[in-house]
């Protein structure tokens, strides 16, 4: 009789999850040679053990301990690009300036970035069919609670000046239910942080609004100086002459408004 | 069987651009990170740089910053490295190549090279 | 970059003899090197990585010590079939950096 099986909203662990990670890890090893003495194996057990035989919906940041512990990595704390709802120009960017880093340009980032992950309570087993959906099911499922662990643990490690780019297409440019509105912006740490800088990001064309003016990063703005945390936003009417002037700054076209 | 095959031997003029292929078969593409390599007439090797074909992420030897281009389709488990600005110089066997996860970051396969070379 | 300085340029050395080829880097690299075998008209082929580990299908009487500067690789007892040039190559850093390698000919 076949054993019944929870069906969860949301969509199955990646197909070749383990396969994925582990080499992933490898793979981050060969590109960044000061990380060579991280044992992916032991990175793939740990990761494995945070929700394999435990109930989906009831994930712990404690169960990821051992894979932060693995994960550790120091990367200069002045140089750390938050983004919401724009990740691919934010890696875009970190790929050109090269000193700067994202959440998924670390090891633990960059073993989950777009994967889906989760077990079944009392069996080893994955589950490929449905994994719990953050809204629908629960918010303690497996992604979720690695995502707000790491994401703290990424703004708690910020100095100096923090930037964090953002979606000017979205209704809610700063959006205080995404990770960076509802994790990183809190976990920033006064004593180190300076200033939070904002680079909103224009996706029109002929778009010449000042979007620092949209109400809702003068929330972000509000909660960040009650946090005691200088803010400062910028526009980036053109991204795609943004990240021209990030490689090549001596272009005569990259002093003026970008 | 794991397999790197590379496109043709190719003739250039000088300050022109040659892109060469290197199709991947026999494993996940994704999963590995892909080297180029280039070797002058009887000359050492020398290593250009790399791509990881999962996100399109590059690095490249200081050397060839401004005229190399690494890319990769992963519908085709294909990486190509693209040389612009030709001089004589540039007159090499180019090869891909990649570790095998389990021997280190040597580089365990090797495409059977791609001759280039650059005339006036 | 890293300095690879390999040792002879070349090396002449009668069948069934043992041959020895060196390998100095411009820094302490650990034991992040590979030695690899080079055939006229063939692509390289991976011997050694690691300093001291043989890759697969590598006969044992190849071998490397070394680590930090100074390595080498022994062939124990030469065979016709390997006459060729051997490489070093650090991946310790990028960019990664190779000898100017060894030609090893018959006596």
């Known amino acids: 009789v076949p054993r019944w099986r929870q069906q969860w909203s949301g969509p199955g662990t990646t197909k070749r999850f383990p396969e994925t990670v582990l080499a992933r890890c490898v793979k981050y090893t060969e590109i960044h040679p000061e990380m060579r003495h991280v044992d992916c194996q032991s990175v793939w057990d740990a990761f494995k053990g945070a929700f394999i035989s435990k109930h989906p919906c009831n994930i712990t940041e404690e169960d990821y301990q051992p894979l932060m512990k693995l994960g550790t990595q120091t990367v200069p704390c002045n140089k750390i690009l938050l983004w919401s709802r724009i990740k691919d120009l934010a890696h875009q960017f970190t790929q050109v300036q090269r000193d700067m880093f994202t959440l998924e340009d670390t090891l633990l980032g960059y073993l989950a970035d777009d994967l889906t992950w989760c077990g079944e309570f009392n069996t080893s087993k994955i589950n490929y069919q449905s994994c719990p959906d953050w809204r629908k099911d629960c918010s303690n499922n497996p992604v979720s609670v690695f995502w707000k662990t790491v994401s703290r643990r990424f703004a708690e490690a910020a100095c100096d000046v923090v930037h964090v780019m953002l979606n000017g297409s979205r209704s809610k440019i700063f959006d205080k239910n995404s990770t960076f509105g509802s994790v990183e912006v809190h976990n920033l740490q006064p004593e180190k942080v300076q200033t939070l800088e904002a680079w909103v990001i224009h996706g029109g064309r002929e778009d010449s609004r000042d979007l620092c003016q949209d109400p809702t990063i003068k929330e972000l703005e509000s909660i960040i100086s009650k946090r005691n945390i200088q803010f400062s936003c910028k526009n980036i009417y053109r991204p795609d002459k943004f990240l021209q002037c990030v490689k090549n700054p001596e272009d005569s076209s990259c002093t003026s408004e970008i | 069987q794991m397999q790197l095959v590379q496109s043709g031997a190719e003739v250039k003029k000088t300050g022109s651009s040659v892109k060469v292929s290197c199709k991947a078969s026999g494993y996940t593409f994704t999963d590995y990170i892909m080297h180029w390599v280039r070797q002058a007439p009887g000359q050492a090797l020398e290593w250009m740089g790399w791509i990881d074909p999962e996100y399109g992420r590059t690095d490249y030897a200081q050397k060839f910053q401004d005229r190399v281009t690494i890319t990769a389709d992963r519908s085709m488990s294909t990486a190509y490295m693209e040389l612009s600005s030709l001089r004589s110089e540039d007159t090499a066997m180019y090869y891909c190549a990649r570790s095998a996860h389990t021997t280190g970051f040597g580089f365990a396969y090797w495409g059977q090279g791609t001759l280039v070379t650059v005339s006036s | 970059e890293i300095v690879m300085t390999q040792s002879p340029a070349t090396l002449s050395v009668s069948p069934g003899e043992r041959a020895t080829l060196s390998c100095r880097a411009s820094e302490d690299i650990y034991s992040n090197l590979a030695w690899y075998q080079q055939k006229p008209g063939q692509a390289p082929r991976l011997l050694i990585y690691d300093a001291n580990s043989l890759a697969d299908g590598i006969p044992a009487r190849f071998s490397g010590s070394g680590s930090g500067t100074e390595f080498t690789l022994t062939i124990s007892s030469l065979q016709s079939e390997d006459f060729a040039v051997y490489y070093c190559?650090?991946?310790?850093?990028?960019?990664?950096?190779f000898g100017q390698g060894t030609k090893l000919e018959i006596k």
């Open positions: 190559q650090q991946y310790n850093n990028y960019p990664y950096t």
